[in-house]
């Protein structure tokens, strides 16, 4: 499955939108920084079969979509930007779902992939727990926004490596 060029453009657009969503100066939030233990190894395309990498990407985008689709998220961000961001993520999910179906037919996805997906889910659980502990404060959301920008950048790099493998 070849991810369309529009997919990586969508990812870049999502990153730009997320960058524009900030409501307060991040300079006031240094003390709120937190180690979410991003599972960097899951974004290393070299150790994966293509089907596995696509599944990890799908999980990453799905969890990001879920995080920004909550009521708490709606209260935190400017509505029109949030809607545009969610639309970009939804389009990416559609692209990836088509690829997952196609690739899983070609390669048998080993158990190792389940571990990778679980690692991504646990990462997002840590983010959600942090937001709950910080009572969804503006600074907590700023920290999470910065963290998601970072993980989306990792996703973009993984997509680039996947295209080079084709």
């Amino acid at each position: 499955c070849d991810l369309p060029q529009t997919h990586s453009l969508g990812n870049r657009r999502a990153l730009i939108l997320l960058g524009q969503m900030g409501r307060i100066s991040p300079f006031s939030c240094l003390k709120d920084r937190h180690d979410f233990r991003i599972p960097q190894e899951e974004f290393d395309g070299n150790q994966f079969q293509k089907a596995q990498a696509i599944s990890v990407l799908h999980e990453m985008i799905q969890q990001t979509f879920n995080l920004f689709s909550t009521e708490d998220s709606s209260a935190a961000w400017e509505q029109s930007l949030l809607e545009k961001f969610s639309t970009e993520l939804y389009q990416q999910l559609n692209d990836l779902e088509a690829c997952v179906i196609q690739e899983v037919g070609v390669e048998e996805t080993p158990l190792m992939n389940e571990d990778s997906i679980l690692a991504v889910r646990k990462y997002f659980q840590r983010i959600t727990l942090y937001l709950i502990e910080r009572k969804y404060s503006p600074c907590a959301w700023e920290v999470v926004r910065a963290e998601i920008m970072r993980s989306l950048s990792f996703s973009t790099n993984l997509q680039k490596r996947l295209r080079r493998k084709d």
């Epitope: 300079f27 240094l30 950048s153």
Partner: antibody, heavy 121, light 107 residues
Framework: EVQLVQSGAEVKKPGESLKISCKGS????????IGWVRQMPGKGLEWMGI????????AYSPSFQGQVTISADKSISTAYLQWSSLKASDTAMYYC??????????????WGQGTLVTVSS | DIQMTQSPSSLSASVGDRVTITCRAS??????LNWYQQKPGKAPKLLIY???SLQSGVPSRFSGSGSGTDFTLTISSLQPEDFATYYC?????????FGQGTKVEIK
């Protein structure tokens, strides 16, 4: 390879203006903040201020607020430190350094080589 | 502003010595503390971040500890290239502040 390359040494007279630069390469320039640090001759490190190149938001140390201006041009991955009217006491080495912003990553992990500014009549 | 106080301001030691530098913050900074090494005519170099994390490429003889207000940088066995000035820096809030520095000299 991550690099911060600063502009060359400057010799100026009191009252003159000056703008020094710091060009980032080997990483996504807008994903990190750029801080400026002063070191006067034989003295320690003093944090002056910082900029987020993604939106040019700035924060200054109270000691330097109104004395200098920090700016950035993300299209050329460059941050700037400028003075409108230099004083002899501005004579120092000025360093730029990369900061991860709100991400859990090392602070000031890469530094420029420094720009020596000499202000003398 | 948060004041950072280092001690001693200078020390003399021999190659192979265990060296300890302390840094005290005027208020709690949790673990938001970094240590830098600076050699004459060179830019500072990050050694330790978040109080105890060793920066990539830094020799394991360097270690950091502490939280709250009291922090320590330890060099387990001083090497010739370690003679330099060391600075602590708090990163919990603006304005970011550095300690005044500790110069490690050859005995």
């Amino acid at each position: 390879e991550v690099q911060l390359v600063q502009s060359g040494a400057e010799v100026k007279k009191p009252g003159e203006s000056l703008k020094i630069s710091c060009k980032g390469s080997g990483y996504s320039f807008t994903s990190y903040w750029i801080g400026w640090v002063r070191q006067m001759p034989g003295k320690g490190l003093e944090w002056m201020g910082i900029i987020d190149p993604s939106d040019s938001d700035t924060a200054y140390s109270p000691s330097f607020q109104g004395q200098v201006t920090i700016s950035a041009d993300k299209s050329i991955s460059t941050a700037y430190l400028q003075w409108s009217s230099l004083k002899a006491s501005d004579t120092a080495m000025y360093y730029c350094a990369r900061h991860p912003g709100l991400n859990w990553a090392p602070d000031f992990d890469y530094w420029g080589q420094g720009t020596l500014v000499t202000v003398s009549s | 502003d948060i004041q950072m106080t280092q001690s001693p301001s200078s020390l003399s030691a021999s190659v192979g010595d265990r060296v300890t530098i302390t840094c005290r913050a005027s208020q709690s900074i949790a673990e938001f503390l970094n240590w830098y090494q600076q050699k004459p005519g060179k830019a500072p170099k990050l050694l330790i971040y978040f109080a105890s994390s060793l920066q990539s490429g830094v020799p394991s003889r360097f270690s950091g500890s502490g939280s709250g207000t009291d922090f320590t940088l330890t060099i387990s066995s001083l090497q010739p290239e370690d003679f330099a000035t060391y600075y602590c820096q708090q990163s919990i809030d603006f304005p970011l502040t550095f300690g005044q520095g500790t110069k490690v000299e050859i005995k």
